[in-house]
């Protein structure tokens, strides 16, 4: 499987709430055996590799903002330090996987990954990452509602080597 | 956990023919399963594979000919005009994510005039 | 679609010696590292040895070994023995259609 991502960019006014997502892409195991872990962080363009970077988002870690569950199963995060955060983080049986974000401010632009790992016996068996910017702007010229800009058909699947 | 195909048997070109992979062990809701078949004296050549949603992917040569589908317990591999090149051993495996781990004895399928 | 080569055809090896069979894929394949090798006997089904291009399958002998990475894989059998005489064949993952290519195999002979 890979992960698509499929809007590149959310520009989105202050105030207004937003959901991030991503999706499972291939064959997907799902085993008796296998689990899935799967968290979103904040990042930056990195010259060598997007997303290498992992930075929290509104003060949550990705370990803060993580989904643990077996291949047939959707989760959600119901912890109520994300919820206190404005943040909730969601998987469903389709593998669609996303994250929301409760009245935005400047402070949440930037860009955001989310990250798949399929984890088999116990140890990380293969690892998968998509990248979206999120730009929430304020004044005359924000839009009045979230604008989502679709990924090209390459920049929708991004794919990171284990 | 174990894979079984049967179906496999003499036909004449042209004649459909469905083979049937049972497992047992593991359930198919969870399971990605592959088609592969190998001539005699030939190497190993993938069909293709149903995964968990159902969704058929198929190599290249393959597609418009075979046709992969499942029930509650079995997954079927649907042959149509068959000729003599089609003569092998066709095997059932379960496919993790990039490697099949677990494989059926296979069934031959043998077409001649 | 992507076409798997194996070398050599077919390797002869004695007893205790080491066995290096090479698998070149015409495009990388899945993660770069979407490579399995199996091992089969004849009138046996293939069995898995070494999954993404370097993770020895439970219960397999530490005496196989893989390793490479994009388009260049090598499995590595040292100490060979008796019951290592068999056909090994590599095969890629490709997630342009999630797909597999086998290669030839390479048939191992040991003496």
């Known amino acids: 499987f890979k992960v698509a991502t499929p809007y590149s960019l959310y520009v989105c006014p202050e105030g207004q709430n937003v959901t991030l997502t991503c999706r499972l892409l291939g064959p997907v195991d799902k085993g008796h055996d296998v689990t899935f872990y799967k968290t979103w962080y904040r990042s930056s363009r990195g010259e060598v590799q997007t997303c290498s970077e992992r930075r929290p988002i509104r003060n949550l870690t990705f370990q803060d903002l993580h989904l643990h569950h077996g291949g047939h199963q959707a989760a959600n995060t119901s912890h109520d330090l994300a919820q206190r955060h404005g943040l909730e983080s969601a998987s469903d049986h389709h593998g669609n996987f996303s994250i929301t974000m409760r009245n935005l401010t400047l402070l949440d632009s930037g860009l955001y990954c989310c990250l798949v790992v399929e984890i088999r016996h116990h140890h990380s068996e293969h690892r998968v990452h998509g990248a979206m910017e999120l730009q929430v702007q304020t004044g005359k010229d924000a839009p009045s509602n979230c604008v989502v800009y679709p990924s090209s058909s390459q920049d929708s699947e991004n794919i990171t080597a284990a | 956990q174990s894979v079984e195909e049967s179906g496999g048997r003499l036909v004449t070109p042209g004649t459909p023919l469905t083979l049937t992979c049972t497992v047992s062990g593991f359930s198919l809701s969870s399971a990605n399963m592959g088609w592969v078949r190998q001539a005699p004296g030939e190497g190993l050549e993938y069909i293709g594979l149903?995964?968990?949603?159902?969704t058929t992917y198929y190599a290249s040569w393959a597609k418009g000919r075979f046709t992969i589908s499942r029930t509650s317990t079995t997954v079927d591999l649907k042959m149509t005009s068959l000729t003599t090149e089609d003569t092998a051993t066709y095997f059932c495996a379960r496919l993790r994510t990039g490697y099949g781990d677990l494989w059926g004895p296979g069934t031959l399928v043998a077409v001649s005039s | 679609q992507a076409v798997v080569t194996q070398t050599p055809s077919s390797v002869s090896a004695a007893v205790g010696g080491t066995v290096t069979i090479s698998c070149q894929s015409s495009?990388?394949?899945?993660?770069?590292?979407?490579l399995s090798w199996y091992q089969q006997k004849p009138g046996q089904p293939p069995k898995l040895l070494i999954y993404r291009a370097s993770n020895l399958e439970t219960g397999v002998s530490s005496r196989f070994s893989g390793s490479g990475s994009g388009t260049q894989f090598t499995l590595t059998i040292s100490g060979v023995q008796c019951d290592d005489a068999a056909t090994y064949y590599c095969a890629g993952y490709y997630s342009s259609g999630w797909y597999y290519t086998f290669g030839g195999g390479t048939e191992v002979v040991v003496k």
């Open positions: 495009q990388s394949v899945y993660n770069n590292n979407f």
């Open positions: 149903i995964d968990t949603d159902g």
